[in-house]
């Protein structure tokens, strides 16, 4: 992986044929920021600038649309924002920023609405979104953010609303609140500085008791010669209904612990971006996956990191030590007095007395950091969202496999070994103008994970199998979603009846998995061709014989016969070998990839001059041959003739 | 002890800027709110924001944001309040206040002697 | 918006005993704080109670503070009432969204 981090193994440009996507866009609209799957699977609502739309996923190909609601700000909204300095064009607008399912017949939407945040329900039909009525629109202040580059997040657990937001037009009092719902509307305080004025929500996630918040801050108790940003989680318990007097309507239950994404001895990854829950059969070993970025951009580059946390870990930062705020040195030290009950933070369902409401409202920073696991560390990229899944192997184990936005508009696909680093299958550049992914959404029953962008939503089928035209490089792709049939001799999406199928997500060694078996055959360091092309050379040209790279992650180098011809030879150029016709040019020519210890040839040429014919070597009878054209240059110039086949790069 | 001097009463003329301020001693500066008040002639008390200043957070009042500018420098425990374009109506003695911890809550504690500021043409 | 109301004016004879009152808008007055601060002619205000009902130092008993949460409102109660208390009055809370609001202001004074 060298200092870079870990390589995508195929690489796709925008507009590349070989992966298969579809894209949706619609006339007139942008920002397609906010997605929602149906409970069903097969219905995507997007919250788009002042829209929102259903989408219907459950064929392949392009997303349909079923149908699309407007939401636009009012015109007095608008008028106003613009009064205010706000710009007209790209401000004054209802951005979607929140997009639930409340029950079976509503989502529950909120939107920037032209910096006066606003909430309403959307009455659903069959998954048909129903007009919205202005008279139920509500005030959405403190569950939208005013403006829509703010951070924010949202979920709805048990008919609930748990937000994290800006709430006020200035974007500078962060706000944790719980609206909808029977419970009383709870929030955080101000005055008390649980939240730095520019903490920036990132993501809510319900566990068992408590919902967990993740954000990013300006740390305060650190001493630190520049502005040093943390990451950090918050819980708040879901029984928490608020003070009588003393917090009234406030959170009594608000804890928060700084979060911690480092490699050992390296400066952290301290901003958080995104976080996801993957769920586990027991939720004590279910783990949070977070993207952080960093404040300080080593050798000039932006990097980014991939921390798993597990939720016991968390609880247990939570039920240790605090810290305290010493207001004459303005310094935090760990708090060393006696424990008081209930002790906050601890759901417990007994009203709380004053004693220990002024204990909380002051204690609600922890000592000790939740320590992260890396996963993976990446240069000269940032990720901005991520999804995550559990693949089951062939063998049945289990691979967490993650999909990545980036900053500049492309998806990683990165697999995570059990209890070793991630891998980087491939990278598929989505937007054509580098624009930075807005959401990502998984849809495991249509396996697809849908990319929100500013002009669109692209739809990503997990795997590419079928790109893996060979055994040998179906395996090393290390795919947990593909594997090698070989009856049909396609590498394919893993499905119910997989028996005889060839994959090696361990090792991802096609040395064994590609013969017939360990017993079959002794090993051979280099494989046969599977394909021999014949190439006819041509008086005074020179052949160009091209060299697909398959794998990133491969070394390529090209043979004569048994002899490797060397990298330092002028004939090698761009990877294609340059022939020019003459005594002892023809014969076997092989391209050979290196990767993983395994070579194998990525392409076979028989290189034939019409006067000289050569017989073809008796170890290469049974390889099925295909006559082809190749790219020549005549000597003394001349046009290029095209070839027959074209060579794709990754 | 504890106390906040505030700056001396200034005369200016519509749309000139001006910025007053209030220095704290006599307990750590950091760690405290200071909260400004408008008391315009014979009238009442109103609250027009509040600023935090081991950071610099300022939050303001609903009728003050927009208006006017809070900011402090935390190295000579000086808490500020300035206008871009002063009005004839900003006529008033401006209070600055601490923000202690009572009991359970905050409550304004100490306080400044005013600085009055008149506007005319 | 939430608005604290008192009365403009009350007055009393000296060694008397006074209540000023503040009512909330919306909402109960219990479920916040109340603060009251005097106000003497032509000086900075300074607090007399603090959180419904507690004294700063050195601010003499005569002094006390109280919720009614029957008729909505606090109270401010000076007893034995000297020449020196004339001065207006004010209360303070803090509306939903924790900005301080405060009464419009009670001029005491004493005959």
């Known amino acids: 992986t060298g200092g870079q981090g870990p390589m995508p193994r195929v690489k796709y440009h925008a507009g590349d044929g070989h992966r298969a996507l579809s894209f949706f866009q619609q006339k007139g609209l942008r920002d397609f920021d906010t997605l929602l799957l149906s409970d069903d699977g097969n219905t995507l609502y997007v919250g788009a600038r002042e829209a929102v739309l259903a989408l219907n996923i459950q064929n392949p190909g392009i997303p349909r649309l079923k149908n699309m609601i407007p939401w636009p700000a009012s015109e007095r909204k608008k008028t106003e924002c613009a009064f205010k300095k706000k710009s007209n064009e790209t401000q004054c607008f209802n951005f979607i920023r929140v997009l639930v399912s409340y029950n079976a017949t509503h989502l529950y939407a909120c939107g920037t609405f032209a910096f006066s945040p606003a909430c309403t329900f959307i009455e659903l039909q069959d998954s048909l979104l129903l007009p919205i009525l202005i008279d139920k629109v509500m005030d959405g202040k403190g569950q939208s953010p005013f403006d829509p580059v703010h951070k924010h997040t949202a979920v709805l657990v048990d008919g609930m609303l748990y937000s994290g937001t800006m709430n006020n037009f200035l974007g500078s009092e962060p706000i944790l609140m719980r609206t909808l719902g029977s419970q009383p509307v709870l929030k955080t305080d101000i005055f008390l500085r649980w939240l730095h004025a520019d903490a920036s929500f990132v993501a809510a996630i319900p566990s068992t008791q408590v919902v967990y918040f993740f954000f990013e801050e300006t740390a305060s108790e650190f001493d630190f010669f520049e502005e040093l940003y943390i990451s950090r989680v918050a819980q708040v318990c879901k029984n928490d209904v608020g003070g009588e007097k003393l917090l009234q309507k406030k959170w009594t239950t608000f804890l928060k612990a700084q979060l911690l994404c480092a490699q050992p001895g390296q400066l952290p990854f301290n901003i958080i971006r995104h976080a996801v829950l993957l769920p586990a059969d027991s939720p004590s070993v279910s783990r949070i996956y977070a993207v952080f970025t960093s404040q300080w951009q080593v050798g000039g580059t932006r990097s980014s990191a991939v921390c798993a946390f597990s939720l016991t870990d968390i609880e247990r930062v939570f039920k240790g030590k605090y810290k305290e705020l010493n207001k004459e040195t303005s310094r935090w030290t760990t708090y060393r007095g006696s424990e008081v009950s209930p002790r906050p933070g601890s759901c417990s369902m007994g009203p709380s007395s004053d004693k220990a409401l002024t204990f909380m409202k002051d204690h609600f920073l922890m000592d000790e950091h939740v320590v992260g696991t890396p996963l993976l560390v990446k240069s000269g990229v940032e990720y901005t969202r991520l999804a995550v899944e559990s693949a089951r192997g062939l063998d049945g184990s289990s691979h967490v496999v993650m999909y990545l936005g980036t900053s500049t508009g492309s998806l990683h696909k990165a697999v995570v070994p059990q209890d070793s680093s991630a891998y980087l299958v491939e990278e598929i550049q989505l937007s054509p103008d580098s624009e930075p992914v807005r959401n990502l959404q998984l849809a495991p029953a249509q396996g697809a994970v849908f990319a929100g962008f500013s002009g669109g939503i692209w739809r990503v089928p997990r795997a590419n199998c079928s790109v893996y035209e060979s055994c040998v490089d179906c395996v090393l792709a290390r795919d947990p979603h593909c594997a090698w049939d070989p009856e049909s001799r396609l590498c394919s999406l893993l499905s119910g009846s997989t028996k005889p199928w060839k994959q090696d997500m361990e090792r991802g060694n096609p040395e064994w998995v590609c013969t017939r078996g360990p017993m079959a055959r002794s090993p051979r360091r280099q494989s046969p061709p599977q394909l021999i092309k014949e190439v006819l050379t041509v008086p005074n040209s020179i052949l160009e014989l091209p060299c697909p790279h398959l794998s990133a992650l491969a070394s390529y180098h090209w043979s004569h016969g048994r002899a490797k011809i060397s990298e330092a030879s002028a004939t090698v150029y761009n990877g294609s070998l340059l022939l020019l016709p003459q005594d002892g040019v023809g014969g076997l020519y092989q391209c050979v990839a290196t990767e993983n210890g395994y070579s194998y040839p990525v392409v076979s040429y028989w290189v034939d001059s019409q006067d000289q014919p050569l017989a073809l070597d008796p170890e290469l009878a049974g390889v099925p041959r295909e006559r082809v054209q190749v790219p020549l240059t005549r000597v003394g110039g001349g046009a290029s003739m095209a070839a027959q086949r074209s060579y794709w790069p990754h | 002890q504890v106390q906040l001097v505030q700056s001396g009463a200034e005369v200016k003329k519509p749309g000139e800027s001006l910025k007053i301020s209030c220095k704290g001693s006599g307990y750590s500066f950091t760690s405290y709110w200071v909260g400004w008040v408008r008391q315009m002639p014979g009238k009442g008390l109103e609250w027009m924001g509040i600023i935090y200043p081991g950071d610099s957070d300022a939050r303001y009042g609903p009728s003050f944001q927009g208006q006017v500018t809070i900011s402090a420098d935390k190295s000579i425990n000086t808490a500020y309040l300035q206008w871009n374009s002063l009005k004839a109506s900003d006529t008033a003695t401006y209070y600055c206040a601490r923000l202690g911890d009572g009991a359970y809550y905050y409550y304004l504690d100490v306080w400044g002697r005013g600085t009055m500021v008149t506007v005319s043409s | 918006s939430y608005e604290l109301t008192q009365p403009p004016s009350v007055s009393e004879s000296p060694g008397r005993t006074v209540t000023i009152s503040c009512s909330g808008s919306s909402g109960s007055i219990a479920s916040n704080f109340v603060h009251w601060y005097q106000q003497r002619p032509g000086s900075a205000p300074t607090t007399v109670i603090y959180?419904?009902?507690?004294?700063p130092s050195g601010v003499p008993d005569r002094f006390s503070g109280s919720i009614d949460s029957s008729s909505n409102s606090a109270s401010l109660t000076i007893s034995g009432l000297k020449t020196e208390d004339e001065a207006d009055y004010y209360c303070?809370?803090?509306?939903?969204?924790?900005?301080?609001?405060f009464g419009g202001g009670t001029k005491l004074t004493v005959l």
């Open positions: 959180e419904d009902d507690q004294r």
């Open positions: 303070q809370s803090y509306d939903n969204n924790d900005h301080a609001v």
